[in-house]
């Protein structure tokens, strides 16, 4: 599994699209990283 920052972004984007743009306050990303690094 992807274990760094961009993966978080992609998962969050998917979550946003599935939830109509609302993210629960208790949403904490899993252990993943960023393509911007």
């Amino acid at each position: 599994a992807c274990d760094t920052a961009t993966c978080v972004t992609h998962r969050l984007a998917g979550l946003l699209s599935r939830s109509g743009g609302v993210v629960k306050n208790n949403f904490v990303p899993t252990n993943v990283g960023s393509k911007a690094f």
Epitope: C2, D3, T4, A5, T6, C7, V8, T9, A13, V28, P29, N31, G33, S34, K35, A36, F37
Partner: antibody
Framework: EVQLVESGGGLVQPGGSLRLSCAAS????????ISWVRQAPGKGLEWVAE??????????HYAEAVKGRFTISRDNAKNSLYLQMNSLRAEDTAVYYC?????????????WGQGTLVTVSS | EIVLTQSPATLSLSPGERATLSCKAS??????VSWYQQKPGQAPRLLIY???NRYLGIPARFSGSGSGTDFTLTISSLEPEDFAVYYC?????????FGQGTKLEIK
């Protein structure tokens, strides 16, 4: 204009402590993930630690070589990043860079400071 | 830890020539690879992210390709300012890691 200014480097004896700072300006600091990356004289780049944004619970990750000795932290109100370095060793001698990055869709951003030199020697 | 192996260690070329730099990962990293350029006394500069995307302001002569474990940075026609050290990095797994670097020098 984006600016990142590291400070706090210097000469320290083995076993000593040092606290590095990175002052940021020109962008929304709290949105960014931040890493410290170091480079020993004449050597390659080595990732040291990362702290995520406030919205990501400011989660931290560390390289094995510094785990338990170094602590990364941030103060979003002061637009500042810190690296507390304890139990310093000769092999920690390096230029330390702060690196800020933001990744959302096409909004990729990546900023480096100019670096601050840490020398561990007796 | 994912090990990135860059080759060659040193590449000697002339301005106008094409440069091809390789980066091989010890494990699959999908496209979570970036390429950096570093000149003496300066901080690294991001060139390519996501294996093939040029960062803001990076000239079109720089391109990246690859996925999985094999990655390539290509500079189509070298300019005098391109002679520097190039590093690949991966951000697919912690710890983030860098390759050992390829020094691109003037022939």
């Amino acid at each position: 204009e984006v600016q990142l200014v590291e400070s706090g480097g210097g000469l320290v004896q083995p076993g000593g402590s040092l606290r590095l700072s990175c002052a940021a300006s020109g962008f929304t600091f709290s949105n960014y993930w931040i890493s410290w990356v170091r480079q020993a004289p004449g050597k390659g780049l080595e990732w040291v630690a990362e702290i995520r944004s406030e919205s990501d619970a400011s989660a931290t990750h560390y390289a094995e070589a510094v785990k338990g000795r170094f602590t990364i932290s941030r103060d979003n109100a002061k637009n500042s990043l810190y690296l507390q370095m304890n139990s310093l060793r000769a092999e920690d001698t390096a230029v330390y860079y702060c690196l800020l990055y933001f990744d959302y869709g096409l909004a990729i951003q990546n900023y480096w400071g100019q670096g601050t030199l840490v020398t561990v020697s007796s | 830890e994912i090990v990135l192996t860059q080759s060659p260690a040193t590449l000697s070329l002339s301005p106008g020539e094409r440069a091809t730099l390789s980066c091989k990962a010890s494990k699959r990293v999908t496209t979570y690879v970036s390429w950096y350029q570093q000149k003496p006394g300066q901080a690294p500069r991001l060139l390519i992210y996501g294996a093939s995307n040029r960062y803001l302001g990076i000239p079109a002569r720089f391109s990246g390709s690859g996925s999985g474990t094999d990655f390539t940075l290509t500079i189509s026609s070298l300019e005098p300012e391109d002679f520097a050290v190039y590093y690949c990095s991966q951000s697919y797994n912690y710890p983030y890691t860098f390759g050992q670097g390829t020094k691109l020098e003037i022939k």
